[in-house]
Interface confidence: low
């Protein structure tokens, strides 16, 4: 009932709670002397379903048969309408439409840890839409029973609050859940289990790692477990990896030796526990332990390359370059590099430790036979030294690779190809492809890049430190014993027409011809490798087409003679530059009048 119903009653047959699809009879009846004043025959009783009028009748009572009610709650209200007055609410009723509970499915129970309590979960089945009580019953040995209830249509979990103990681990317990509402009841299938079946150990805790004698090969993982744990599984991985290494151990008693860890690597370790070989379930994984393994002596050898530069008749500059060891080769933090320079005949040697750089430059005499050895050192020791005899890398002309070409290969890649040298190609032990940004001044501070290629290869894709619209000087060296030959070419990964033309800085007269000098185009405006310069000239104030002279680009060249100008005629001159993609705009214009000889 929804109010005091002083004026009348609403009755519902067969019940306020009905099965979905059932029919109900609703009767609204007025109490004596509660009709319309003086006009009892004019009583108009109206039945509302929520706010919608569904039936009416003149008199003291109204009967209505209602079908097709939806799941859930439907509100019916009876009102009285008298002439010349508002409708008066008489009484109302709620009808609850639902279904009997389905059989609860998948009943499963678990006790978290040896000291935990037994809790069970199940699948309710479909919503009954009614007040439904769930009763969970657990029966054990010696006729012991426990019972817990919850009264919520969403109930699918109950904790008994009792702790099963391992005194008799094989004793059977049986759990059953029963759902009851006004329309019926249903019980799950019983679930029978033992202590060992349902106890899920707590995850291991207090995980530690020890490295005996600071060595990665002597590593022991320690942890603490609940007392009855028989099995453990360990998983571990480098922190930057997604794949776990797994190890299963029996009767570990809180320790296990790990034999395959890499040095100087941060690892993540987790452990899980189980009480029985084939009964029960694994615990959750423990919290992660993160630990770095100790360093070990570096393995591998440095990749070393060098450059020679003539200074004067007696001295030369040697620049050594080397690449960092990979993380797996360095096996620790590289503290310094040791460079030893030795004159092989006189036995003089000089050793220097280099920190923070992967290059070293020194000046040595041009005479004598020189060798270098470079190694990397961490806190545990040094790598094997890489030894190189300093020779003239381009001295053996017959070893020079032939037909060297450099072509763009996608974004920021250059494909370098060559043919083996004329001299017996089988004499080649390896090729080295070297590249560096082209700087007109031949700047030795420009970083050097190189890669090594096997003697049977005739191409290499270079991609490291390659930028678009930059010209690279590329050299291919063929090495054979203590001899080397080389060929060079310019190449770029991407090019377009230069952004500006050369700037003419001087025009001088020499024996009836002129010499034009210019400033190089700034590297960032060249937009790739320059192929040609063009010098244009025409008579001042003339509308004729200019004449031009095309000069192949040379890195060091910045002047050129022209001998086809007429004396005592004023000319306007300018220059452009060309890449494979096109011609630049004009550089500056200069006027010049060749004086020549008077007739």
């Amino acid at each position: 009932k929804i109010d005091a119903c002083k004026r009348g009653d609403v009755t519902v047959k067969p019940s306020h709670v009905i099965l979905l699809g059932s029919t109900v009879n609703i009767t609204c009846s007025l109490k004596p002397r509660q009709g319309c004043f003086h006009y009892s025959r004019r009583n108009k009783l109206i039945l509302y379903k929520f706010d919608r009028r569904i039936n009416f009748h003149h008199g003291h009572s109204l009967n209505s048969q209602v079908t097709g009610l939806p799941l859930g709650t439907t509100l019916f209200v009876c009102k009285l309408a008298c002439i010349n007055s508002d409708e008066i609410q008489i009484c109302g009723a709620e009808i609850f439409v639902g279904v009997a509970p389905e059989q609860p499915q998948n009943l499963s129970c678990i006790q978290k840890g040896e000291q935990g309590t037994v809790a069970c979960t199940w699948e309710r089945g479909r919503d009954t839409h009614l007040y439904t009580e769930y009763t969970l019953q657990l029966s054990g040995p010696k006729n012991l029973t426990w019972q817990k209830q919850c009264k919520d249509i969403y109930c699918d979990y109950l904790d008994f609050g009792i702790n099963l103990t391992p005194e008799s681990p094989e004793s059977n317990f049986t759990a059953k859940v029963t759902a009851v509402n006004s329309l019926g009841s249903s019980s799950s299938l019983p679930s029978t289990f033992t202590f060992l079946d349902i106890v899920r150990p707590l995850p291991p805790w207090d995980i530690r790692i020890k490295f005996q004698k600071a060595s990665v090969s002597r590593c022991t993982l320690y942890w603490r477990d609940e007392g009855l744990v028989l099995l453990n599984r360990l998983r571990y991985r480098p922190s930057n990896s997604r794949l776990w290494n797994m190890v299963n151990v029996t009767k570990a008693k809180g320790r296990h030796d790990l034999l395959d860890l890499k040095p100087f690597t941060e690892y993540e370790f987790q452990i899980s526990s189980k009480l029985h070989l084939y009964k029960g379930s694994w615990s959750d994984w423990s919290e992660s332990l993160r630990a770095q393994t100790p360093e070990e002596e570096p393995t591998g050898m440095l990749d070393v390359w060098y450059m020679k530069r003539h200074i004067d008749y007696s001295r030369q500059q040697i620049s050594l370059f080397w690449k960092n060891l990979s993380v797996s080769e360095a096996r620790g933090k590289i503290l310094h590099y040791q460079v030893t320079l030795q004159e092989l005949t006189g036995g003089k040697a000089m050793t220097q430790n280099i920190t923070g750089h992967t290059s070293w430059t020194t000046v040595i005499p041009r005479t004598g036979n020189w060798a270098v050895a470079v190694s990397a050192a961490n806190s545990k020791g040094s790598s094997l030294p890489t030894r190189i005899n300093i020779m003239n890398l381009c001295e053996a002309g017959l070893l020079a690779p032939r037909q060297v070409s450099a072509n763009s290969e996608g974004m920021d890649n250059i494909l370098v190809t060559w043919q083996p040298p004329r001299k017996d190609p089988s004499a080649v032990q390896e090729y080295v492809v070297e590249w560096r940004e082209l700087h007109p001044g031949g700047d030795t501070q420009v970083p050097l890049n190189w890669l090594r290629s096997r003697p049977y290869n005739v191409s290499a894709l270079i991609s490291e430190n390659i930028k678009s619209y930059i010209c690279y000087e590329i050299r291919v060296y063929a090495l054979s014993g203590d001899q080397g030959g080389c060929s060079s070419i310019l190449g770029n990964s991407k090019h377009k027409a230069p952004l500006s033309g050369p700037h003419i800085n001087a025009i001088t007269e020499e024996k009836g011809s002129i010499l034009i000098s210019w400033n190089s185009i700034p590297v960032q405006e060249q937009m790739g490798c320059l192929l040609h310069y063009r010098i244009y000239w025409k008579e001042r104030d003339s509308n004729s087409q200019p004449q031009l002279c095309e000069i192949p680009y040379r890195v060091s060249q910045n002047s050129h003679p022209i001998n086809s100008l007429q004396p005592r005629v004023t000319y306007v001159l300018w220059m452009t530059a060309l890449t494979a993609a096109g011609e630049s705009s004009h550089g500056n214009e200069r006027e010049f009048c060749l004086q020549g000889k008077a007739n």
């Epitope: 499915q105 699948e123 309710r124 089945g125 479909r126 919503d127 969403y154 699918d156």
Partner: nanobody
Amino acid sequence: QVQLEESGGGLVQAGGSLRLSCAASGRTFSSYVVGWFRQAPGKEREFVGRISWSGARTYYADSVEGRFTISRDNAKNTVYLQMNSLKPEDTAVYYCAADLKWEVLLSEHYEYWGQGTQVTVEP
């Protein structure tokens, strides 16, 4: 009353993956079975798969078995359809539907429906 809204559709290359979501309003959502259906242009609506109230049970049409996975997060009132190894023939509007009954395959037996989300798989 349950309102459903699908999201996550889009354009994908054959062999790729998509995850559709079906978000619901209403406190009783965890009591509903949720089914996924799809309708390609000019074809009848087709059953894809369904998931039980708790997520413990799933059932799939043969055409998607092994490639599609349905899961649910009742705390977020959301059901998901993870679609892997997509094929051009998976192109369709995908709908989610909810009902209190488990043994429901026919779309007309589902009580509540979403508006659908378009999935296009390019060859």
